[in-house]
């Protein structure tokens, strides 16, 4: 297993609709044809997997059916979007990139993006 640098923004603020997007960029040492991207969430020293996708050549990442993530890729950049976020989901979201093929296998883990989610205030009653 060889190490690889992964960069991602330090902080992202989710939209009022609970959507957060960020770019995960990896320094590929060679021409990988199969890449696996995993988003991990770290909160209270616990790490859980949020979503993962394996992609090849194309620019659309395909996630499992119940995933809250969507994404696209362009070169060594992956554009990730996480949906359905609520205030309780605030935390550090870490991008993990694995170059699965061809060998050698490379692994890179970013420093994480702190995603802040603020639940929208309920609209006050109005006469209008």
């Amino acid at each position: 297993c060889k190490a690889m640098h992964v960069a991602q923004p330090a902080v992202v603020l989710a939209s009022s609709r609970g959507i957060a997007s960020f770019v995960c960029e990896y320094a590929s040492p060679g021409k990988a044809t199969e890449v696996r991207v995993t988003v991990l969430r770290q909160a209270d020293s616990q790490v859980t997997e949020v979503c993962a996708a394996t992609y090849m050549m194309g620019n659309e990442l395909t996630f499992l059916d119940d995933s809250i993530c969507t994404g696209t890729s362009s070169g060594n950049q992956v554009n990730l979007t996480i949906q359905g976020l609520r205030a309780m989901d605030t935390g550090l979201y870490i991008c993990k990139v694995e170059l699965m093929y061809p060998p050698p296998y490379y692994l890179g883990i970013g420093n994480g993006t702190q995603i802040y989610v603020i639940d929208p205030e309920p609209c006050p009653d109005s006469d209008f």
Partner: antibody, heavy 115, light 106 residues
Framework: QVQLVQSGAEVVKPGASVKVSCKAS?????SYWINWIRQAPGQGLEW???????????YYNEMFTGRVTLTRDTSTSTAYMELSSLRSEDTAVYYC????????WDQGTMVTVSS | DIQLTQSPSFLSASVGDRVTITCSAS?????IHWFQQKPGKAPKLLIY???TLASGVPSRFSGSGSGTEYTLTISSLQPEDFATYYC?????????FGQGTKLEIK
């Protein structure tokens, strides 16, 4: 030029298995997904699953989980789809298609399940 | 699973007509891709990533849309365009296709 060539038509009995091959040429086999899709007579397209030929990573349509197995042989640039416990509803044309974009298809393999 | 619903399922039109086929997704998708299939033949990639024409596809074909609503438009129907058209999503597994739109000569 890019080409996918599948094995010939099969007639199989209910409960049996069938293994369809898809030989790729004209491109780097390990650089693109091989997808498997089927089409029952007069019906639409149904995705079965896909395999990454380099690592062997597979994704399946849960509708087929436990009955379908996708494999590949990189030495011959050939992908395989095996479907077991066949029933009459599995009668269909089975296609392999290349990559994320499904940009190249073979003409398909007709599998008929009949007693 | 993400369901894709195409409308109409059947469409009768004449050479030279402008036709539009819609594809509605049960959940927001990143892109929609379109295929054309003629009887007895394998499907052929027509448009990928919502609006990019595949190699060799005539410019009378175009695609647009976002979120859950997408369209395929043929600006001026040619005799060779009479076929069945399918939309497809690859945002989540399982990959799914629409039920198809059969375009027939009026």
């Amino acid at each position: 030029q890019v080409q996918l060539v599948q094995s010939g038509a099969e007639v199989v009995k209910p409960g049996a298995s069938v293994k369809v091959s898809c030989k790729a040429s004209g491109y780097t086999f390990t650089s693109y997904w091989i997808n498997w899709i089927r089409q029952a007579p007069g019906q639409g397209l149904e995705w079965i699953g896909r395999i990454a030929p380099g690592s062997g990573t597979t994704y399946y349509n849960e509708m087929f989980t436990g009955r379908v197995t996708l494999t590949r042989d990189t030495s011959t640039s050939t992908a395989y789809m095996e479907l077991s416990s066949l029933r009459s509803e599995d009668t269909a044309v089975y296609y392999c298609a290349r990559g994320d974009y499904f940009d190249y298809w073979d003409q398909g393999t007709m599998v008929t399940v009949s007693s | 699973d993400i369901q894709l619903t195409q409308s109409p399922s059947f469409l009768s039109a004449s050479v030279g007509d402008r036709v539009t086929i819609t594809c509605s997704a049960s959940k927001s998708v990143s892109y929609i891709h379109w295929f054309q299939q003629k009887p007895g033949k394998a499907p052929k990639l027509l448009i990928y990533d919502t609006s990019t024409l595949a190699s060799g596809v005539p410019s009378r074909f175009s695609g647009s849309g976002s979120g859950t609503e997408y369209t395929l438009t043929i600006s001026s129907l040619q005799p060779e365009d009479f076929a069945t058209y399918y939309c497809q999503q690859r945002t989540t597994y399982p990959l799914t296709f629409g039920q198809g739109t059969k375009l027939e000569i009026k």
